[in-house]
Interface confidence: medium
C-alpha cells in the first residue's frame, strides 16, 4: 500500500479529556426568548398584584357609588386578561419551542447538513480557522486573487501542527510566503520574515513557497499549483 | 336600585377577584415548572464529545478534528490494526468512518493514503456491514464483490477501496455525526 508522506502527529487520547459544551444557536436563542417571555409575565404579574392590593386597600369595606365599582371591575377584568394571556403564553411557548426545534432539526437534516460554524458552505473547519481546499490549479498570484475574492487569504501556516494537518488533507498547495528575489528574505503576506526552512531556496528562479507533503519548498511563482484559502475565526 | 347595582358590581368584582387569584396561582405553578424545565431539560443537549459553537448554524468539532458538512472527522497519521483503530474511535465517542457517498471526504480527494473504515464482513448476515449494522450499498464500491470476506476495508478519499488483512496497520478515520 502506498503511503502518503510525513505526518508526524496524531491524536493524544487523555483518560478523561475535558470538553466544553455549548448550546446551538437556535436553541440558545429560543431558551432566551422563553426567559424573556417569563420575565415579561413576571413583571406583569407583579404589577397586577400591586394594582390589586392597592385597590383593595383603597376601596375596602366602603359603600361606593357605581363608578368606582365599575373601575374596580374594569381593573380586575384587565388583570384577568393579562393573567390569562400569561398562562396561555407559558403553556403554548414551550410546545412551540419543541416543535420549532424538531422542525429545525428536520430541516437541517434535509438540507444535507452542509453548513458548519462560521465557515462558508463546503469549507472545512479546523482549530478555529476555515479552509477552502481548492482543486483548481493557479499561479501564485492568481491564487492570491482567488482567495481575496473569497474574503480570505492565501493559505498561511502559523505553526508546525497546522502544517502537519494540512499535509494530511492535501499533498501540495501554494502558501502565502514569497520573496522578491533569492537575495531577499522569505516573507509572509503581512510582511513579516518567515523563519522556517524552505527547501531549494538557493535556486534564484523559485521565489514563491509551496507546502509539499509536510515540507515547505520554493517553486516558480508562475507554476500552476493547487491553492487553498484560509480564514481565521 | 342603587343598592342592587352596587351588589351586582360587588358580585362581578368578587367573581373576577377569584378568577384573578386562581389565574395567579396557575401562573405561579406554570412559572415554577417552566423554570425547572428550562434548567433541567435544555432544548438540545450535545453529546459529551461535541463542542457546539455559539452563533453557529450547525457545529464545531473537538480540537484537532476536522469539521465538514456537519460531521467531525479525526484523520490519523498513526498506523493501527483495524481493531485498534475501532477502539480508538470508540474511546472518542465516535466510530470508524461510515461513508454516505464517495464524495463525503471531498476535501481530501487528493490524498494518496488509504485509511481503515468501519466496514467488515458479517458471516451471520453474509453481507458487508457498517459498524451501525447497516449494509454496504452496492453502488458505493463497485469492486466490493471481489473483496476477501476475511479482510477489512481500507479506503482512499478519492473513492478507491481495497481489502487488506485486518492485522495490517493503516491510518484510520473516525467520524462523529453532529446532527
Amino acid at each position: 500500500m502506498d503511503n502518503q508522506g510525513v505526518i508526524y502527529s496524531d491524536l493524544n487520547l487523555p483518560p478523561n479529556p475535558k470538553r466544553q459544551q455549548r448550546k446551538p444557536k437556535g436553541n440558545k436563542n429560543s431558551i432566551l426568548a422563553t426567559e424573556q417571555e417569563i420575565t415579561y409575565a413576571e413583571l406583569n404579574l407583579q404589577k397586577a398584584s400591586q394594582d390589586f392590593q392597592g385597590n383593595d386597600k383603597t376601596y375596602h369595606c366602603k359603600d361606593l357609588p357605581s363608578a368606582p365599582e365599575k373601575l374596580i371591575v374594569g381593573i380586575l377584568g384587565i388583570i384577568c386578561l393579562i393573567l390569562m394571556a400569561s398562562v396561555v403564553t407559558i403553556v403554548v411557548i414551550p410546545s412551540t419551542l419543541i416543535q420549532r426545534h424538531n422542525n429545525s432539526s428536520l430541516n437541517t437534516r434535509t438540507q444535507k447538513a452542509r453548513h458548519c460554524g462560521h465557515c462558508p458552505e463546503e469549507w472545512i473547519t479546523y482549530s478555529n480557522s476555515c479552509y477552502y481546499i481548492g482543486k483548481e490549479r493557479r499561479t501564485w498570484e492568481e491564487s492570491l486573487l482567488a482567495c481575496t475574492s473569497k474574503n480570505s487569504s492565501l493559505l498561511s501556516i502559523d505553526n508546525e501542527e497546522e502544517m502537519k494537518f494540512l499535509s494530511i488533507i492535501s499533498p501540495s498547495s501554494w502558501i502565502g510566503v514569497f520573496r522578491n528575489s533569492s537575495h531577499h528574505p522569505w516573507v509572509t503576506m503581512n510582511g513579516l520574515a518567515f523563519k522556517h526552512e524552505i527547501k531549494d531556496s538557493d535556486n534564484a528562479e523559485l521565489n514563491c513557497a509551496v507546502l509539499q507533503v509536510n515540507r515547505l519548498k520554493s517553486a516558480q511563482c508562475g507554476s500552476s499549483i493547487i491553492y487553498h484559502c484560509k480564514h481565521k475565526l | 336600585m342603587a343598592v342592587f347595582k352596587t351588589t351586582l358590581w360587588r358580585l362581578i368584582s368578587g367573581t373576577l377577584g377569584i378568577i384573578c387569584l386562581s389565574l395567579m396561582s396557575t401562573l405561579g405553578i406554570l412559572l415554577k415548572n417552566s423554570f425547572t424545565k428550562l434548567s433541567i431539560e435544555p432544548a438540545f443537549t450535545p453529546g459529551p464529545n461535541i463542542e457546539l459553537q455559539k452563533d453557529s448554524d450547525c457545529c464545531s468539532c473537538q480540537e484537532k478534528w476536522v469539521g465538514y458538512r456537519c460531521n467531525c472527522y479525526f484523520i490519523s497519521s498513526e498506523q493501527k490494526t483495524w481493531n485498534e483503530s475501532r477502539h480508538l474511535c470508540a474511546s472518542q465517542k465516535s466510530s470508524l468512518l461510515q461513508l454516505q457517498n464517495t464524495d463525503e471526504l471531498d476535501f481530501m480527494s487528493s490524498s494518496q493514503q488509504f485509511y481503515w473504515i468501519g466496514l467488515s464482513y458479517s458471516e451471520e448476515h453474509t453481507a458487508w456491514l457498517w459498524e451501525n449494522g447497516s449494509a454496504l450499498s452496492q453502488y458505493l464500491f463497485p469492486s466490493f464483490e471481489t473483496f476477501n470476506t476475511k479482510n477489512c476495508i481500507a479506503y482512499n478519499p478519492n473513492g478507491n477501496a481495497l481489502d487488506e488483512s485486518c492485522e495490517d496497520k493503516n491510518r484510520y478515520i473516525c467520524k462523529q455525526q453532529l446532527i
Epitope: 500500500m1 502506498d2 503511503n3 502518503q4 508522506g5 510525513v6 505526518i7 508526524y8 502527529s9 496524531d10 491524536l11 493524544n12 505553526n159 508546525e160 501542527e161 502544517m163 502537519k164 499535509s167 523563519k195 522556517h196 526552512e197 527547501k199 507533503v213 509536510n214 515540507r215 515547505l216 | 480540537e63 484537532k64 497519521s77 498513526e78 498506523q79 491510518r171
Partner: antibody, heavy 118, light 107 residues
Framework: EVQLVESGGGLVKPGGSLRLSCAAS????????MNWVRQAPGKGLEWVSA????????YYADSVKGRFTISRDNAKNSLYLQMNSLRAEDTAVYYC???????????WGQGTLVTVSS | AIQLTQSPSSLSASVGDRVTITCRAS??????LAWYQQKPGKAPKLLIY???SLKSGVPSRFSGSGSGTDFTLTISSLQPEDFATYYC?????????FGQGTRLEIK
C-alpha cells in the same frame, strides 16, 4: 546556536522510576516537535516518544507505552520523559532530538545514560 | 510498524572509494526517509532528509536517492572522517523506525 542538554540519567533498580529532562536553547522551543530516542549499549537507535509543539499530539513506541510519559514546559524550554516500571532492557543512552517543522531530527543532545540493574 | 532493513550491516572501504548503502522499507513510505551518521560516543547527525535532500552544511559527496520502498545513500569519495555508522529512518508514520545501522570501517 541550537543546544539540547539531557539530564536525569543514572542507575535505577528494575521496577523503579526516573525522570529525564532536556533543556533547550538557541531556538524557539515552543515551535518545534521534540522526540526522545535511545540507544542500548552497542546497539542501534530506537525511537521512544514524540510530542508536538503545543503537546496536542503525543506518541510512544509500543515497547514503552503505558510506562513512559513525555511532556514539555514551553515556558521553561524543557522536555521531560517520566520513566516508570523500568526494566533491564530500558538500559540505554537517551537522546532528545528536535524536529524542524516536520523535518527529521536536525539537532540532538549529547545523551544521558540510564542503567537499570539490580 | 514499518521495518527498515539496511544492507550491508558492515563494510570495509578505503579513502577515495565510492560507497553505497541501501535501505529497504517493508511498505511504501514515499520519500519520507532520512540518513544519519553516528560516530562512537557521539549523537547522530542528520545528513539527508526527504530521501535525497542534503542538509545544509553536509558535504556534497553525500547523496541520497530512492522513493517508495528502496533507498540508497552514496558517498562519492570517502574521506577519513566518514568512517562511522550510518542509519536510515522513516518518518512517514508513527511509530518512527530506524534501520539496524551499517558500520563503515577503514579497510
Amino acid at each position: 546556536e541550537v543546544q539540547l542538554v539531557e539530564s536525569g540519567g543514572g542507575l535505577v533498580k528494575p521496577g523503579g522510576s526516573l525522570r529525564l529532562s532536556c533543556a533547550a536553547s538557541g531556538f524557539t522551543f515552543s515551535s518545534h516537535s521534540m522526540n526522545w530516542v535511545r540507544q542500548a549499549p552497542g546497539k542501534g537507535l530506537e525511537w521512544v516518544s514524540a510530542i508536538s509543539s503545543s503537546s496536542s499530539y503525543i506518541y510512544y513506541a509500543d515497547s514503552v507505552k503505558g510506562r513512559f510519559t513525555i511532556s514539555r514546559d514551553n515556558a521553561k524550554n524543557s522536555l521531560y520523559l517520566q520513566m516508570n516500571s523500568l526494566r533491564a532492557e530500558d538500559t540505554a543512552v537517551y537522546y532528545c532530538a528536535r524536529e524542524e517543522w516536520g523535518l527529521p531530527f536536525d539537532y540532538w543532545g549529547q545523551g544521558t545514560l540510564v542503567t537499570v540493574s539490580s | 510498524a514499518i521495518q527498515l532493513t539496511q544492507s550491508p550491516s558492515s563494510l570495509s572501504a578505503s579513502v577515495g572509494d565510492r560507497v553505497t548503502i541501501t535501505c529497504r522499507a517493508s511498505q511504501g513510505i514515499n520519500s519520507a526517509l532520512a540518513w544519519y551518521q553516528q560516530k562512537p560516543g557521539k549523537a547522530p547527525k542528520l545528513l539527508i532528509y526527504d530521501a535525497s535532500s542534503l542538509k545544509s552544511g553536509v558535504p556534497s559527496r553525500f547523496s541520497g536517492s530512492g522513493s517508495g520502498t528502496d533507498f540508497t545513500l552514496t558517498i562519492s569519495s570517502l574521506q577519513p572522517e566518514d568512517f562511522a555508522t550510518y542509519y536510515c529512518q522513516q518518518f512517514n508514520s508513527y511509530p518512527l523506525t530506524f534501520g539496524q545501522g551499517t558500520r563503515l570501517e577503514i579497510k
